[in-house]
């Protein structure tokens, strides 16, 4: 049996060497002269040599300094031969621990850690970590126990501790108000890791902790007061440029600024923000009444995009804005005019008056009225009065310039200011209908077959309106009953079926017509017939001589 | 809320083995180092073991060095305790506890503890 | 590794008196930082133990002020100016400056 105690060794140790370790032994060195050596790695394998064995005794030696970072157990096998080469025990595994020593400092992983807080940050709010690494043995040693510290931080400023690090786990965090980046934007500290727990090797890195910008400052106007003019009646006009200064990071949403008039109810102005320079442009949302209002004192308000932060005044600047009056155009009131007219209207007699009222009522101003359009020539205008008068008759049935018994007019009024303004005023003349037409036959030229004819119907049309029209009465006059007869197509009475009494020649017949509408206003019109030489439903006859009275005249 | 929730315990055998758990939340587990606590009874309390943030410290106490393992799963936001070769006098409430983000102190927050018993 | 040893293992006092308790630390513990990490805690019945007292002297958040530590290097003290009725139950001293960290045995505060 083997007899080996257990066996560890240092790291780097000094010389001389080789240096014992342990004496092995075989029982069986007893019963005769034992051999022993030694295989496996540091001994006959790489790296070779670092373990010897003395044949005859058993010490087992090392030859020099170990390093527990690079090799922390050898694995070899101790063997013992009789002096015969022959084996007297089996193979035996020595393992041989190397106990650490601290020669190794912590590391950093990085040179520089980089880390970031929002300003105004509460203590106890985590900012980074910082991690450090040590080569010696952590599970049997506190040589790789390490704990952190800050050694520095620059600026040392509002306080010298704004930080503090966790020993253990190198996690820094706020320990004191006051981070301000418009103030101090960076903070580099240098970081201290020691191993033993603190009290042995140490290195150091650098922690920079960007301080980030939160909404803290107030956009502030500068200046507070600003003046303005702007014409009367102009909207999206620049009247004044307000500037600001905000000590937040610049083209963010706590530095962008925010407008708002406090004092603009009717919503007449409206301010705009220079995404470039943060600028207010304040402008006229509609335009604005010089004769109402001459000048505003406006209230203005600035913010940020997002709310403040903090509990912060709100900066306000007074605008005072004035108005310049310019000429405007007289106002036709109404602006459309409807008046009411028989088109019997006398030629001549004044119809109505329509004037306009002057909106620059500082002004004293002369009016002159003028016709602009007037497509009929029906009517005149006194220039100094707006009197309208009929200059020609008026005809409700003048389709051309009527539409729906209305003729527009346009009038015009012009100032004599300076430059000269001209208002526009619409004139609708509603003309009431009077019985000035009689009915009359369509269609007026009418074809028959001369065999087996197909009656007509002739529709009776009158341009005038109810009660000048149907029911309409129709009679055959000058002899026409003689070879035609005519009946009504409906109960209104406003078509009537014209067909022939007997047999007709071919050739051209006049017809006269007499029509009478619901007000007895009558017309003899006379219808054009032509019998064709055809048989049921008449298409287009050759053209013959006339017959009148519906007799035909011979050629 | 800062909640520390402990499971796992139970009646274990001697030389047996155990591990407990600690689910964290109401806090950003990962920037927190952890301990675990006990209580036998009728004795007082005993520090067991402490893991950094990154796991990349770990201290133990001498009598449960070699046989606990504390270790931390920062993405299911979990603190464990292996234990191996139980021994009757590591029957105990066990406490799982945050040291605070500073380190001025040890231990800021307790749950409410998990019973081991090592009996045969 | 360090040693905490507490006197007395139990303290029985009247509800207003003023109560002491002492922790000593069988060597130094100043951490190499300068800090003194010497904490206190409380375990009352049936509750889970919490802080009062961290770096020898600063009161823990919503700690009453009638609670007071002192000490330095091995030698340290927990007073209790006026004791109430919600102060009975087991205190303990703990140090966090050399790992392994260790409590100290207990510290049970009683109605005489």
């Known amino acids: 049996d083997w007899v080996i105690p257990p066996i560890s060794c240092p790291e780097n140790e000094k010389g001389p060497f080789p240096k014992n370790l342990v004496q092995i032994k075989s029982n069986k060195d007893k019963e005769g002269k034992v051999f022993y050596s030694i295989t496996g790695q540091g001994a006959d394998t790489p790296p070779v040599g670092v373990f010897i064995i003395e044949r005859e005794t058993g010490w087992l030696k090392v030859t020099e300094p170990l390093d527990r970072e690079r090799i922390a157990t050898y694995t070899l096998f101790s063997h013992a031969v009789s002096s015969n080469g022959n084996a007297v025990e089996d193979p035996m595994e020595i393992l041989i621990t190397v106990t650490d020593q601290n020669d190794n400092k912590p590391e950093f992983t990085q040179e520089v850690f980089k880390g970031s807080v929002m300003e105004g940050a509460l203590p106890g709010t985590s900012v980074m970590e910082v991690t450090a690494t040590d080569a010696d043995d952590d599970v049997n040693t506190y040589n790789a126990a390490i704990a952190y510290t800050i050694l520095s931080q620059d600026p040392e400023l509002p306080d010298k501790n704004m930080f503090t690090i966790n020993r253990n786990t190198g996690v820094i965090s706020v320990v004191t108000t006051g981070l301000d980046r418009e103030s101090f934007p960076t903070y580099t500290l240098v970081v201290q890791a020691a191993d033993l727990q603190g009290e042995g090797l140490s290195t150091t890195a650098t922690a920079v902790i960007t301080v980030t910008d939160t909404n803290d400052n107030p956009p502030i106007f500068n200046p507070t007061t600003y003046k303005g003019q702007v014409p009367e009646n102009e909207a999206n006009v620049v009247i004044t440029t307000l500037k600001v200064t905000d000590a937040d990071a610049p083209n963010t949403p706590a530095w962008e600024a925010v407008y708002t008039i406090l004092n603009d109810d009717g919503g007449q102005f409206v301010v705009t923000t220079n995404p470039v320079n943060n600028d207010g442009i304040l402008k006229t949302a509609k335009g604005l009444d010089f004769e109402a209002k001459q000048q505003y004192i406006l209230h203005v308000a600035v913010t940020n995009v997002v709310p403040f932060e903090v509990s912060l005044t709100t900066s306000t600047a007074t605008v005072t804005v004035d108005v310049l009056d310019v000429n405007e155009a007289p106002i036709f009131v109404p602006p459309e005019k409807r008046v009411e007219v028989s088109e019997d209207f006398g030629v001549g007699q004044e119809i109505t008056s329509y004037t306009a009222q002057e909106p620059d009522t500082f002004m004293e101003q002369k009016i002159t009225y003028r016709i602009w359009r007037d497509t009929a020539n029906w009517l005149e205008i006194n220039p100094d009065t707006g009197a309208i008068s009929t200059r020609a008759e008026l005809d409700r049935e003048d389709f051309e310039h009527v539409k729906n018994s209305t003729y527009t007019a346009l009038i015009i009024a012009t100032d004599n200011g300076s430059p000269v303004a001209t208002g526009t005023g619409t004139l609708l003349l509603i003309l009431s209908d009077v019985n000035d037409n009689a009915p009359i036959p369509e269609p007026r030229t009418i074809f028959f077959c001369e065999r087996n004819p197909k009656p007509q119907v002739i529709n009776i049309i009158d341009a005038d309106l109810p009660p000048n029209t149907s029911p309409f009465t129709a009679e055959l006059t000058h002899g026409a009953s003689a070879n035609w007869t005519i009946q009504y197509n409906d109960p209104t009475q406003e078509s009537i079926i014209l067909k022939p009494k007997m047999a007709l020649e071919v050739g051209d017949y006049k017809i006269n017509l007499k029509l009478m509408d619901n007000q007895n206003k009558d017309q003899v019109t006379t219808l054009e017939v032509s019998v064709c030489d055809c048989e049921g439903a008449a298409g287009v006859c050759r053209k013959a001589q006339p017959v009148e009275a519906g007799l035909q005249i011979p050629a | 809320d800062v909640q520390l929730v402990e499971s796992g315990g139970g009646l274990v055998q001697p030389g047996g083995s155990r591990k407990l758990s600690c689910a964290a939340s109401g806090f950003t587990f990962s920037s927190y180092g952890m301990h675990w606590v006990r209580q036998a009874p009728e004795t007082g309390l005993e520090w067991v073991a402490y893991i950094t943030t990154r796991s990349s410290t770990i201290y133990y106490a001498a009598t449960v060095k070699g046989r606990f393992t504390i270790s931390r799963d920062n993405a299911r936001n979990t603190l464990f305790l292996q234990m191996t070769s139980l021994r009757s006098e590591d029957t105990a409430m066990y406490y799982c506890t945050r040291e605070p983000l500073t380190g001025y102190y040890a231990m800021d927050y307790w749950g409410q503890g998990t019973s081991v018993t090592v009996s045969s | 590794d360090v040693l905490m040893t507490q006197t007395p293992l139990s303290l029985p006092v009247s509800l207003g008196d003023q109560a002491s308790i002492s922790c000593r630390s069988s060597?130094?513990?100043?951490?190499?930082?300068?800090?003194?990490?010497l904490e206190w805690y409380l375990r009352k019945p049936g509750q889970s133990p919490r802080l009062l007292i961290y770096?020898?002297?600063n009161r823990f958040s919503g700690v009453p002020d009638r609670f007071s530590g002192s000490g330095s290097g091995t030698d340290f003290t927990l007073k209790i100016s006026r004791v109430e009725a919600e102060d009975l139950g087991v205190y303990y001293c703990f140090q966090g400056s050399h790992a392994p960290w260790t409590f100290g045995g207990g510290t049970k505060l009683e109605i005489k």
């Open positions: 060597q130094s513990i100043v951490h190499s930082d300068g800090n003194t990490y």
């Open positions: 770096k020898v002297s």
